[in-house]
Interface confidence: medium
């Protein structure tokens, strides 16, 4: 840090410099400090956000920004329809310029960009763009968040109504409504060429007060490809004077940016004022802490179908900054199928986003109830190729819960997959806040977004008059590096099933209040930051931001035939084509693993594998997805093992064991039934066997206890 002494009252943000002087017609002033002394403020220290209220009273208001947006608390507002953009597709003129204000980097827009719709009271004109970022390597830097997920960068575009005011500054000074769009930037493997003019400009304003003209850019290309899914709320400026005059539009889909491009933000300098000492420091973490929602309501857009593609990949396949917590988003496409009367097959697909590659292996956690007793096991799937496992020795009259977690290097873990419940003759799926009838066992329409850690210890709660008993399972984790990885699928007892009406009779709906909205806080020595995740009713696996995907298909046994061997570019554009089909990998005969017992550890993990990463922009090929955005997401096929015999009588009390799949050299395009005895409707696991998805209404991981190593049962 460079320090130098100034012998005059330092005004760290004076009038805009040379560029401003050449624009006498400009009414733009970026957080301008007049000589009369607009209050000095900073993002930390003695002039930090907690002190803003002393000089800007509005900063202590009850409708402040930014906020954390909880998707499941947001109501759909019919008035929030499509945004109308005008001028956004035009190239910017050579008068557009960028300035390092010392608090942000701002783009002063010199062209006419208008927005209307989205409930805005009129036609608003874009005035400026500002950025907020973190400190390094994609760390959290956004001001807003969704379900607790923050992003490396947030871009904010500010608008005013030119029919009411002659300038943006006038609107603010007269405390009149302005508009603001918040756009998240998320790390992607490759550079986003649309950002090139911005990144180039950043390199020209490294130092405080520097200004530069920008190369032409298209503002629309800095927005998400899909604009239909957005949140709306009324809030404030996120910097002093914190005026509560802002109609916020927060886009749910992020824009891709590479690590390399992020470095341009992290390279910006500012000058800080402490008494008479001015220091030159990096401008980093220039975000305001989040504010209370208080009595406000967050709305979400009512654009037709805008949210259908967006739930799974965002809400629990986070595209937000998770680098410090988990190594990947959850395994997806969970499926449970009966193989015969004493065996179940669990299959899944690789996570869509890997923060810390590679995945070494997977841990399957399963639990069951028998005569009111609750038992649980964890099993390490010692492969990154064959994404399925067989649980043998199952008992048809027990309820089974399954969930899967990826294990990465350094024992980092992914978020958990959704939990699948399986019980013979059960004919309902619990999906979000409703229970629906199902057909034959198939992939759940719910997604990994639906999984939530249910407990952090043994607790019994009563909600809406229905008692629940939850028992955590050992997961094989040391100190948790993920807020959500400290628990494994908790047992839902038969009491719960009775409460849900599974003992007979139909339930047409299931109140979300039945699930506790907050987990009891365990007295953990070190608490994880809590976050809440929606249990959605329409969550579909998605390829990532800015790519639309139709609902997952479940065309068993057909995928291999559809799979084409593509030639990938040097950067692997099509590297993960049809990646979910890896379980169809050729003949194998793999070792059988018994579920970990209390006195032994699970098999050692093994190797890595490729995985899809966050999407790379609307016009680029997404690894693992066809360029055709209408192509359906593929599903994990569930081949039936041909040679698995019942190992014990179904009536025995022997706990289930998990085995890796055994294959014969049969045609991979056709599913096979067990060779010894085809399943019939008379089998204990019949066509009427179903599975259920547990979707607690909220996920909060605060106070989760870390658990012992695999197989060490408590």
């Amino acid at each position: 840090v460079l320090h130098y002494v100034v012998c005059f009252p330092a005004l760290t943000e004076g009038y805009v410099g040379t560029l401003q002087e050449s624009r006498q017609d400009s009414s733009v002033q970026i957080r301008r400090r007049k000589a009369s002394g607009d209050p000095y403020w900073a993002y930390s220290g003695a002039y930090g956000p907690e002190h803003w209220v002393t000089s800007s009273v509005s900063c202590g208001g009850s409708h402040q920004s930014p906020i954390d947006i909880l998707d499941h608390h947001a109501r759909v507002g019919d008035e929030y329809q499509e945004l109308q953009l005008d001028g956004f597709d035009n190239e910017s003129s050579n008068k557009t310029w960028m300035k390092n204000t010392g608090k942000t980097v701002a783009i002063l827009l010199k062209d006419d960009y208008f927005v209307s719709g989205a409930g805005l009271p009129g036609r608003f004109k874009a005035e400026k763009v500002e950025f907020h970022w973190g400190h390094s390597n994609g760390s959290a830097g956004s001001e807003h968040s969704v379900n607790g997920r923050r992003f490396p960068v947030e871009m904010q575009i500010f608008f005013y109504n030119p029919d009411d005011f002659d300038s943006f500054q006038t609107a603010i000074s007269e405390n009149r409504i302005i508009g603001a769009m918040a756009i998240f930037f998320q790390v992607s493997p490759r550079d986003n060429s649309a950002l090139d003019p911005i990144i180039h400009g950043l390199k020209g304003v490294v130092h405080h007060e520097k200004e530069t003209f920008l190369d032409p850019f298209i503002l629309r290309d800095l927005l998400p490809a899909s604009l239909g899914s957005y949140y709306r709320y009324t809030g404030s400026l996120t910097t002093p004077p914190c005026s509560e005059i802002v109609e916020w539009i927060v886009f749910r889909r992020p824009v891709p940016i590479s690590y390399h491009q992020l470095e341009a933000f992290y390279s910006i300098f500012t000058t800080e004022q402490q008494d008479h000492v001015k220091s030159v420091e990096y401008l980093r973490n220039n975000f305001r802490p989040q504010q209370a929602l208080n009595d406000r309501v967050v709305s979400k857009s009512a654009v037709r179908d805008a949210w259908n593609h967006d739930l799974a990949d965002f809400l629990d396949n986070p595209l937000g900054t998770e680098a410090s917590k988990v190594c990947s988003s959850p395994p997806i496409h969970m499926k449970v199928q009966p193989l015969n009367q004493t065996a179940l097959q669990v299959s899944w697909s690789q996570p869509e986003t890997i923060y810390h590659p590679p995945i070494m292996n997977y841990m399957i956690s399963y639990s069951w109830t028998k005569n009111e007793d609750e038992k649980e096991k964890t099993f390490t799937k010692d492969s990154d190729k064959d994404l399925k496992a067989t649980i043998s020795h199952v008992s048809p009259d027990s309820l089974y819960l399954f969930r899967v977690q990826a294990v990465c290097r350094n024992d980092m873990r992914s978020d958990f997959s959704q939990t699948m419940l399986f019980q013979a003759n059960t004919t309902r799926i619990f999906q979000g806040t409703r229970i629906v009838k199902t057909g034959v066992p198939t992939a759940s329409p719910a997604s990994s977004a639906d999984m939530a850690p249910i407990s952090s210890g043994s607790s019994t709660w009563t909600s809406s008059g229905i008692p629940f008993s939850f028992v955590s399972m050992a997961t094989g984790m040391g100190p948790s590096s993920s807020g959500s990885q400290a628990t494994v699928a908790s047992v839902v007892t038969s009491t719960l099933l009775a409460g849900l009406g599974f003992g007979g009779g139909g339930i047409s709906s299931f109140p979300s209040t039945v699930w506790p909205t907050r987990l009891p806080t365990a007295s953990a020595a070190s608490k994880q930051a809590g976050r809440t995740v929606l249990a959605t009713t329409e969550a579909l696996a998605s390829p990532g931001p800015d790519v639309h995907s139709a609902p997952s298909k479940d065309s068993e046994g057909t995928e291999e035939g559809e799979k084409e061997e593509k030639s990938e570019s040097e950067d692997g554009e099509r590297e993960h084509e049809e990646e979910e089909k890896d379980s169809e990998k050729k003949e194998k005969s793999e070792a059988t693993h018994t579920a970990a017992e209390s006195d032994r550890t699970a098999p050692a993990p093994t190797p890595s594998s490729p995985h899809r990463t966050a999407a790379e922009g609307g016009h680029q090929t997404i690894p693992g997805r066809r360029q055709d955005h209408s192509a359906p997401a593929t599903d994990q096929p569930g081949h039936v093992a041909p040679d698995l015999d019942p190992l014990v009588d179904t009536a025995t009390q022997v706990p289930p064991t998990a085995t890796e799949e055994h294959y014969s050299g049969s045609d991979p395009r056709r599913p096979e039934m067990p060779s010894k005895k085809p399943m019939s409707r008379g089998d204990r696991f019949s066509e009427d066997s179903k599975f259920i998805t547990v979707n607690p209404a909220e996920k909060n991981t605060s106070g989760m206890l870390s658990r012992p190593s695999p197989g060490r049962m408590e």
């Epitope: 390597n137 493997p189 690590y259 390399h260 490729p610």
Partner: antibody, heavy 120, light 111 residues
Framework: AQSLEESGGRLVTPGTPLTLTCTAS????????MSWVRQAPGKGLEWIGL??????TYYASWAKGRFTISKTSSTTVDLKMTSLTTEDTATYFC???????????????WGPGTLVTISS | SFVLTQPASVQVNLGQTVSLTCTAD??????ASWYQQKPGQAPVLLIY???RRPSGVPDRFSGSSSGNTATLTISGAQAGDEADYYC?????????????FGGGTQLTVTG
């Protein structure tokens, strides 16, 4: 174009520490696993270790303690070698994984290599 | 420790098809990559994830895997295919992570 280039290879006497540098162009090292691989004259390829995008390092068992990989910037990775013996004479390559979230020893970009000769 | 085994040398007649193998105890649970290296040059990635070909690699090169054996098949062998071929996989658990190279196979194209 994306490329790698090693530098720092030279003739040194046994026991002399040596640092090799791998310089990337066209991409950021924050996004990829970067491995060092060596090849003794007339022998096969031998993996030394890697550094991932987040700066975590992993080494072959024989390399632990004597070899250190570090990321010195978004475009350079160093391999520091100590306690060198004649057995360490080899061409040293740096190599980049094909895909940022792909880590199965699929290196699609290699440097041309730099020769390190240990001789007394 | 984990070892990938490759035949030291293989001969093939010009225009014929040749298969190079790579075996390991648990290769069925691992992905293999294949490299070609010509004298004095850096290796070139031919196949990754058992079967996938990077762009620019001729489709005469193909990969497969069955059980604990990964195979690189070169159809219509050409004189320019004479080189050393290495298979690679990964191994690891917990904080351990290794990239493992096979010993290499020297392919000679005759005729």
């Amino acid at each position: 174009a994306q490329s790698l280039e090693e530098s720092g290879g030279r003739l040194v006497t046994p026991g002399t520490p040596l640092t090799l540098t791998c310089t990337a162009s066209g991409f950021s090292l924050y996004s990829y696993d970067m491995s060092w691989v060596r090849q003794a004259p007339g022998k096969g390829l031998e993996w030394i270790g890697l550094i991932d995008g987040g700066g975590n390092t992993y080494y072959a068992s024989w390399a632990k303690g004597r070899f250190t990989i570090s990321k010195t910037s978004s475009t350079t990775v160093d391999l520091k070698m100590t306690s060198l013996t004649t057995e360490d004479t080899a061409t040293y390559f740096c190599a980049r994984e094909l895909w940022p979230a792909y880590s199965s020893g699929a290196f699609n970009i290699w440097g041309p290599g730099t020769l390190v000769t240990i001789s007394s | 420790s984990f070892v990938l085994t490759q035949p030291a040398s293989v001969q093939v007649n010009l225009g014929q098809t040749v298969s190079l193998t790579c075996t390991a105890d648990t290769l069925s649970r691992r992905y293999a990559s294949w490299y070609q290296q010509k004298p004095g040059q850096a290796p070139v990635l031919l196949i990754y994830r058992d079967t996938r070909r990077p762009s620019g690699v001729p489709d005469r090169f193909s990969g497969s895997s069955s059980g604990n054996t990964a195979t690189l098949t070169i159809s219509g062998a050409q004189a320019g295919d004479e080189a050393d071929y290495y298979c690679v996989t990964t191994d690891g658990s917990g904080s351990s992570y290794l990239v493992v190279f096979g010993g290499g196979t020297q392919l000679t194209v005759t005729g």
